[in-house]
């Protein structure tokens, strides 16, 4: 929902969290603002207090229940409002009818680990976190490897077009330090976006055997 210079963007993590960011030029930093969630077919309402993240933007997480509980479905619509205190009253600053499964952003993959490392290749696995069982296998991943002397932005993206929670990196340089990250995205949802990148996993390839051709 956009009103002039106001922008209100929320994503559902597919289980029990709706994360929201509200941006407004010229808004007062010390004003108390809340995001209010009103589902169309649930018996609960939920609020979270918006906290400043920059000069003109605020964020909060609507925590709907235990992390792995399935609190919303594909048919739910949640009316989300930003309300800010003006004296003794609360003013609606932004509003949207939010379709959770059209606005997905999963949690970053976790538990990255090196399964097997050699001189030129490394097998890495990971797990997805708090992802709905509704997706079954309809997920895709992107991965990137940080090489010495390069930045993450320069790293080529490797795309896995299926639910595959491992990768075998090849053509690596022996005895070299690398870092690896992965992110995940459901195939469902018009406004669905990539998860944040995972925490980087550092690993080192094995040195080439002495006297052998590499």
């Amino acid at each position: 929902a956009v009103n002039g210079t106001s922008q209100f963007t929320c994503f559902y993590n597919s289980r029990a969290n709706i994360s929201c960011v509200w941006s407004q030029d010229g808004a007062l930093q010390d004003t108390s603002c809340q995001v209010h969630a009103w589902p169309d077919r649930r018996r609960w309402n939920q609020t979270c207090e918006l906290l400043p993240v920059s000069q003109a933007s605020w964020a909060c997480n609507l925590i709907l229940g235990a992390p792995d509980s399935q609190k919303l479905t594909t048919v739910d619509i949640v009316t989300l409002r930003v309300l800010c205190r003006e004296g003794v009253r609360w003013r609606v600053m932004a509003i949207q009818d939010f379709k959770p499964f059209e606005n997905l952003r999963l949690m970053a993959p976790i538990s990255l680990q090196v399964v097997h490392v050699e001189t030129h290749r490394c097998n890495i696995s990971w797990e997805i976190s708090q992802a709905s069982h509704y997706f079954e296998r309809h997920l895709e991943f992107e991965a990137r490897t940080l090489s010495p002397g390069h930045t993450w932005e320069e790293a080529p993206l490797l795309t896995l077009k299926q639910k595959q929670e491992w990768i075998c990196l090849e053509t690596l340089t022996p005895d070299t330090q690398y870092e690896f990250q992965v992110r995940v995205k459901p195939l469902q949802g018009e406004f669905t976006t990539w998860s944040p990148w995972s925490q980087p996993l550092a690993f080192r390839t094995k040195p080439a055997a002495l006297g052998k051709d590499t």
Epitope: S32, H36, N45, Q46, C48, I63
Partner: nanobody
Framework: EVQLVESGGGLVQAGGSLRLSCVVS????????MAWFRQAPRKEREFVAV????????EYVDSVKGRFTVSRDNAKNTVYLQMNNLKPEDTAVYYC????????????????WGQGTQVTVSS
């Protein structure tokens, strides 16, 4: 189902202090806006203080402003009410309340409640 257990009440002389605690279990604590209410004999239950899910914003009934401080520790699933400069008219049973909706918590109806802790202020 969320459960709330208060503690810290007691008998204190006017001008004294007490710190009430309320431990929350059975659900994710940071979902909840937390509040303190009190009920004096033969009176309605009244709102005392509220603290938002983040702990950043607090509000108080006029009669306790400057004397009472509400706070929360999200790591300990606990909300506190620090009561200073107590007056005989603060005598009541103090109740901890939880609601996932900040805008509903003062209305009493849909809150989860603790069992209450007695505070008696003698003159």
């Amino acid at each position: 189902e969320v459960q709330l257990v208060e503690s810290g009440g007691g008998l204190v002389q006017a001008g004294g202090s007490l710190r009430l605690s309320c431990v929350v279990s059975g659900d994710v604590f940071v979902r909840y806006t937390m509040a303190w209410f009190r009920q004096a004999p033969r009176k309605e239950r009244e709102f005392v203080a509220v603290v938002t899910d983040s702990g950043r914003t607090t509000e108080y009934v006029d009669s306790v402003k400057g004397r009472f401080t509400v706070s929360r520790d999200n790591a300990k699933n606990t909300v506190y009410l620090q009561m200073n400069n107590l007056k005989p008219e603060d005598t009541a049973v103090y109740y901890c309340a939880a609601n996932t909706d900040y805008f509903q918590i003062r209305s009493v109806d849909n809150n989860a409640w603790g069992q209450g802790t007695q505070v008696t202020v003698s003159s």
